[in-house]
């Protein structure tokens, strides 16, 4: 990281340091501690107070984003004294440089794309680097497929997603021969910024008086069981007149996906396309392709 | 219409074991997620352990760790649970139940169920 | 000993609607994890009636609803009819091992 860390201390200092690879911070252990607390102060004045680790002379932060610059601080308490110590990280370059409107999605159900633009006060030629973590193993994923602009980097593919977990830490940084780029991070959810694609093997079967519509639940990235899905089908009559409204119809996932409605012979030509969500967030796909049944002169 | 299709009754002595199968018809056991719950009248439910998707892997209840084993046998659509080192207040009604919500942990369908008694 | 809370019994006439309780924790419904509802019929396996706090799989009527409210949940059956006496069992998910936790169930009596 570029980012310059200043230390604000008393004299007998406790040397606090953090390292934003394993967002650990640490500070050198003292004889007879009888407590010890850590935090981070944000710029909107949120504490965010991590488990100590078992040696209490460091403590890591799970799920914080640092580009807005944040400020550690140490208490610890022996039995002969008390040191505090602050430790700021700020986003050190020039302000404005950093990458924005970042935005990642995933969908196939295993590529993902991450988009970003060049900061307004970047110079022309600003590169900018992105670097994924995921929550468990803390293993950095390099952007394998930069998308350029002018040679400068604007995004991301990636087409394994194996290294990625329910939650993952996204960093932006920035180089530059002229001046300091600042980075910009943020946290995203996996379920959030999947994009499903639309149900698949879509079938219509009628008889005399019904007609049933059966489909399969997506292939998707997070694993996903059949009542997490929530589904949109829209059975459309053709050639009704322009502002004829379409029947949507909701249902829930089920292990048999199927949708059986009443439809008598003779029947007009329909059509019925599907789509598919993440039940908790209905996010919804495009439409699977249309389907007809019926007949013209129904 | 998916069903789940448990081995019958067993009868066994404190020490032992017992392996009892739940086989899945009208789907594919590749596709679902398989969870293991037993039930007494003194404890009610306890849940034992499943296929966790998530992980990848099959995970146990804390107090059964070491006793018991769940596997899969996806070619013929069966899932397996052995309990070892049997004791009395192990009788009870065994299910094997097909997960319907991943993130959201809900059993949509259940097999009837499998009694072990364990009795000296 | 059950981690959710259930009365152990509730009973209603037929046509009467009759609302059964459950309470969990911080670890579980209040997390906040989502909440499940079972029906178990004498002598048979459990039937999911309710999922995510309160939907319906397809085939269970609209007779029966549920909410859920900071660490509590509860479900709701009105119109009772003579074949809803049965036993009655919530479930969620907590961050403690073990993972998936039930109630101890509760004895609907149709009078």
């Known amino acids: 990281e570029k980012s310059d860390l200043r230390t604000v201390a008393p004299a007998s200092s406790l040397n606090v340091r953090f390292d934003s690879r394993t967002m650990n911070l640490s500070w050198d252990c003292q004889e007879n501690t009888t407590f010890s607390k850590c935090f981070l102060t944000d710029k909107k004045n949120r504490v965010v107070e991590p488990r100590l680790s078992n040696n209490e002379c460091s403590c890591t932060f799970r799920e914080i984003c640092l580009h807005e610059g944040v400020t550690f601080e140490v208490h610890v308490n022996t039995s002969q004294r008390g040191f505090q110590q602050k430790l700021l990280y700020p986003n050190s370059g020039r302000e404005g440089t950093a990458a924005q409107n970042f935005s990642c999605f995933i969908y196939n159900a295993d590529l993902m794309n991450c988009t970003w633009a060049r900061g307004p006060t970047a110079p022309r030629d600003v590169q900018y680097f992105l670097y994924i973590r995921n929550s468990k193993r803390r293993r950095e994923i390099r952007c394998p497929y930069y998308i350029q602009d002018s040679g400068t980097h604007v995004g991301c593919h990636l087409d394994n997603l194996s290294g990625l977990t329910s939650r993952n830490y996204f960093l932006v940084n920035g180089t530059s021969r002229e001046i300091g780029i600042q980075f910009f991070d943020s946290l995203l959810d996996t379920k959030k910024i999947e994009r499903f694609n639309p149900p698949s093997n879509v079938t219509v079967r009628c008889n005399t008086t019904h007609c049933l519509v059966r489909w399969k639940q997506p292939r998707t990235y997070q694993k996903l069981s059949y009542l997490d899905f929530q589904y949109q089908l829209d059975v459309h009559r053709k050639n009704t007149q322009p502002g004829t409204e379409n029947l949507l119809i909701n249902v829930s996932g089920d292990l048999e996906n199927r949708y059986n409605f009443p439809s008598s012979e003779p029947r007009a030509k329909h059509s019925v396309k599907i789509r598919a969500a993440d039940v908790r967030i209905l996010n919804w796909s495009s439409w699977s392709e249309a389907i007809e049944f019926g007949s013209d002169d129904g | 219409q998916v069903q789940l299709v448990q081995s019958g009754a067993e009868v066994k002595k404190p020490g032992a074991s017992v392996k009892v199968s739940c086989k899945i018809s009208?789907?594919?056991?590749?596709?679902?997620?398989i969870h293991w719950v037993r039930q007494t009248p003194t404890k009610g439910f306890e849940w034992m352990g499943g296929f966790d998707p998530e992980e990848n892997e099959i995970v146990y209840a804390q107090r059964f760790q070491g006793r018991v084993t769940m596997t899969e046998d996806t070619s013929i659509d069966t899932a397996y649970l052995t309990l070892s080192s049997l004791r009395s207040d192990d009788t009870a009604v065994y299910y094997c139940?097909?997960?319907?919500?991943?993130?959201?942990?809900?059993?949509?369908?259940w097999g009837k169920g499998t009694m072990v008694t364990v009795s000296s | 000993q059950a981690v959710l809370t259930q009365p152990s019994s509730v009973s209603g006439a037929p046509g009467q609607r009759v609302t059964i309780s459950c309470t969990g924790s911080g670890s579980n419904i209040g997390a906040p994890y989502d909440v499940s509802w079972y029906q178990q019929l004498p002598g048979t396996a459990p039937k999911l009636l309710i999922y995510h706090n309160n939907k319906r799989p397809s085939g269970v009527p609209d007779r029966f609803s549920a909410s859920k409210s900071g660490t509590s949940a509860s479900l709701a059956i009105t119109g009772l009819q003579a074949d809803d006496e049965a036993d009655y069992y919530c479930?969620?998910?907590?961050?403690?091992?073990?993972?998936?936790?039930f109630g101890g169930g509760t004895k609907l009596t149709v009078l």
């Open positions: 479930q969620s998910y907590d961050s403690r091992n073990p993972h998936v936790i």
């Open positions: 139940a097909i997960v319907g919500s991943v993130s959201r942990i809900t059993y949509g369908f």
């Open positions: 009208g789907h594919s056991l590749s596709e679902l997620s």
